[in-house]
Interface confidence: low
Amino acid sequence: TGTTDVIVAYNLTWKSTNFKTILEWEPKPINYVYTVQISPRLGDWKNKCFHTTDTECDVTDEIMRNVKETYVARVLSYPADTVLTAQEPPFTNSPPFTPYLDTNLGQPVIQSFEQVGTKLNVTVEAARTLVRVNGTFLRLRDVFGKDLNYTLYYWRASSTGKKKATTNTNEFLIDVDKGENYCFSVQAVIPSRRVNQKSPESRIECTSQEKAVSRETGHHHHHH
């Protein structure tokens, strides 16, 4: 194989969670390099990951400028010893990607919970995204607003029958049986989406009514 032989990229795939967005493709290059270009339309291409031997490219900075736009990327293949010419190198277009619709929802984290009498209060951590405005990273809620719901799955620790509650805030306040321990997990949901509607479920947390002490996990307080 000559050094000027290049292979056109294939299997272009968007990997995106909470707007952190990476384009992946194949194959690993031998004696050639890739350049990724991205555009909110077919034209006005912006170079990213210039002359790289990687098979992935972080395009978060580009897509976060307007998360409701639809973007297309392309991966160009160049010989490793290339000099800039007017001739367009071979390339492959990605599928279209609309961050607001297509980014996966990350696994939520239960920030705190408290069971007092017949009420269970559960608060979901306000997840940060890599979407930045005026130097501040926005929360998932800032971007999605009321499009973003959370579902709470909860059950008596002594049984397996799950119940479900939904909120379009980051907080649940539900009725429970006094003196019973409950286990629960949360899931982020965007009902208006056709695909990528749901996040993975959070880790399961459980109350322990017989203990009146507070437990601290990491930097979050969990009250029982």
Epitope: P40, D44, V67, V133, R141, D142, G145
Partner: antibody
């Protein structure tokens, strides 16, 4: 510093099509929406419509049947066409940049860069 | 369509005085949708305030915005000679985006 430079025919006869173009200098079309606004003599401002860099449009329903806004990313410019004009379309026409603004509960825009305006007169 | 009504139509004040301009919406507007613009004769409008109370780049702190729901206010704490102009409120949340009829701030 982003600047908008606009041009187009200033004198039209009734039933003709108004055509204006706005070029973006010092910045990209990408990541923003681009609006047209008009102001009849001695009156207030009326939003005509907007276009995203990807070509998605929103129009004022009162003008929708006559308006076309398009974008040419290769030239970094966007255009307005308004068909079947009458004397009521006489106005100063402005192009403007709608900057994305995120907030808790949604994603909207405000117009932070404006063209100088083009006076369009419709007269027989 | 959301109709924005500005009052007064004309405000006659002297330099150094305080100006209070009102913008009333026909339907509730989230404060984040509301902007204020200044326009001088023969010039394009200039963004002053967005999100009802955030000053745009380069706008002096004598300009401030407030309000919520259907009632919004632009206040100029101490009028400078260059502040005499027409002021428009605008909502950018519901299509069609609409502007108020304007308030002219003139020298008394």
């Amino acid at each position: 510093q982003v600047q908008l430079q606009q041009w187009g025919a200033g004198l039209l006869k009734p039933s003709e099509t108004l055509s204006l173009t706005c070029a973006v200098y010092g910045g990209s079309l990408s990541g923003y929406y681009w609006s047209w606004i008009r102001q009849p003599p001695g009156k207030g401002l009326e939003w005509i419509g907007e276009i995203g860099a990807s070509g998605s449009t929103r129009y004022n329903p009162s003008l929708k049947s006559r308006v076309t806004i398009s974008v040419d990313t290769s030239k970094n410019q966007f255009s307005l066409k308004l068909s079947s004009v009458t004397a009521a379309d006489t106005a100063v026409y402005y192009c403007a940049r709608d900057t994305p603004y995120y907030y808790e509960g949604g994603y909207y825009y405000y117009m932070d860069v404006w063209g100088k305006g083009t006076t369009v007169t419709v007269s027989s | 369509e959301i109709v924005l009504t500005q009052s007064p139509g004309t405000l006659s004040l002297s330099p150094g005085e305080r100006a209070t301009l009102s913008c009333r919406a026909s339907d509730s507007v989230d404060s984040s949708y509301l902007a204020w613009y200044q326009q001088k004769p023969g010039q394009a409008p200039r963004l002053l305030i967005y999100g009802a109370f955030s000053r745009a780049n380069g706008i002096p702190d004598r300009f401030s915005g407030s309000g919520s729901g259907t009632d919004f206010t632009l206040t100029i704490s101490r009028l400078e000679p260059e502040d005499f102009a027409v002021y428009y409120c605008q909502q950018a949340g519901v299509v069609p985006y609409t502007f108020g009829g304007g308030t002219k701030v003139e020298i008394k």
